[in-house]
Interface confidence: medium
């Protein structure tokens, strides 16, 4: 790993995966196990992230890149680079300090994470409730009562047909 001396910073020629070793007169030494340097010219290697406990390894640490973690089943990532794992709840629940709690009446959560959100207020758009909301699903708003008068026609275009066996991307 010895490299030719540059006239500028003597460390600039050390590639990723090495560090400019102060203790060895600034030769490029390989990063030791469980450490990495992702850019060239570094004077130190960074300690690899360890995916322990509720974290599991998504990508192993290498000499040039840090490990990447995700969460074990029943948990989901929060924060940049999955810095935290938060417990999953069922649909129709939200996570509180005391654990998973059912959504209050008038709110719903259609995911395993996040908070319960209020049902849509159809009347604000001059519409009526077509399908009632549940803890897991929002209400479905329908046409306003006026639109339901005899002779009124729906202006909603038909949904495009899908090929059988294909799920939406």
């Amino acid at each position: 790993f010895e490299r030719t001396r540059s006239l500028q910073d003597p460390c600039s020629n050390c590639p990723a995966g090495t560090f400019c070793d102060n203790n060895r007169n600034q030769i490029c030494s390989p990063c030791p196990p469980n450490s990495f340097s992702s850019a060239g010219g570094q004077r130190t290697c960074d300690i690899c992230r360890q995916c322990k406990g509720v974290f599991r390894t998504r990508k192993e640490c290498s000499s040039t890149s840090n490990a990447e973690c995700d969460c074990t089943p029943g948990f989901h990532c929060l924060g940049a680079g999955c810095s935290m794992c938060e417990q999953d709840c069922k649909q129709g629940q939200e996570l509180t300090k005391k654990g998973c709690k059912d959504c209050c009446f008038g709110t719903f959560n259609d995911q395993k994470r996040g908070i319960c959100r209020p049902w849509t207020n159809c009347s604000l758009d001059g519409k009526s409730v077509l399908v009632n909301g549940t803890k897991e699903r929002d209400v479905v708003c329908g046409p306003s009562p006026a639109d339901l008068s005899p002779g009124a026609s729906s202006v909603t275009p038909p949904a495009p047909a899908r090929e059988p066996g294909h799920s939406p991307q």
């Epitope: 102060n22 203790n23 130190t44 300690i47």
Partner: antibody, heavy 122, light 107 residues
């Protein structure tokens, strides 16, 4: 846990060389630098040199180049510093201390021995 | 060799006061500066590494700052147990050097 064990004191006759020991435990001895540091009474810290046990690579402070010689015995996880031709000027506490060898802690010394008090006197 | 100069040589402060210790390098050492605390009759202990990183277990009243040639150790609220000598050292050059130390007394 990491420990660096040093004898508490050494009484040395002027001119008679002395070999100070530093026994390491609680970590992989070969992958951390061992530094030696001198502290005279009421004074600051003076870096003598360091050694990498894996291959016995050494660095010395020029001031101590002819005074101190650093060695290791990997089989017993022990580092040694031999002081040659000691005079009263060499009376001091001598510390061995561990330093991470990969720069991850910016070459800081993270563990220190208790120090050996060397008295050079006839 | 890189020379590290600490100031003041000694100081006497009261419990609860904010304390600032200075360390100057004779040339640019980046952030490769450590601070050590040495209590009477004890060996030094690492407080700060990389100029500003607090070593695990060190109380958060100790803060390091600075880069290049000027470095500072701050104790936000002095405690009686902080009576000690404080040393800075550089690891930028493979020839390590330490400052002369600052002796901190409690009034």
């Amino acid at each position: 846990q990491v420990q660096l064990q040093q004898p508490g004191a050494e009484l040395v006759r002027p001119g008679a060389s002395v070999k100070l020991s530093c026994k390491a435990s609680g970590y992989t001895f070969t992958t951390y630098w061992i530094n030696w540091v001198r502290q005279r009474p009421g004074q600051g810290l003076e870096w003598i040199g360091n050694i990498y046990p894996s291959d016995s690579y050494t660095n010395y402070n020029q001031k101590f180049k002819d005074k101190a010689s650093l060695t290791v015995d990997k089989s017993s996880n022990t580092a040694y510093m031999q002081l040659s031709s000691p005079t009263s000027e060499d009376s001091a506490v001598y510390y061995c201390a561990r330093e991470a060898g990969d720069g991850t802690h910016y070459y800081a010394i993270d563990y220190w021995g208790q120090g050996t008090s060397v008295t050079v006197s006839s | 060799n890189i020379v590290m100069t600490q100031s003041p040589k000694s100081m006497s402060m009261s419990v609860g006061e904010r304390v600032t210790l200075s360390c100057k390098a004779s040339e640019n050492v980046g952030t490769y500066v450590s601070w050590y605390q040495q209590k009477p009759e004890q060996s030094p202990k690492l407080l700060i590494y990389g100029a500003s990183n607090r070593y695990p277990g060190v109380p958060d009243r100790f803060t390091g700052s600075g880069s290049a040639t000027d470095f500072t150790l701050t104790i936000s609220s002095l405690q009686a147990e902080d009576l000690a000598d404080y040393h800075c050292g550089q690891g930028y050059s493979y020839l390590r050097t330490f400052g002369g130390g600052t002796n901190l007394e409690i009034k």
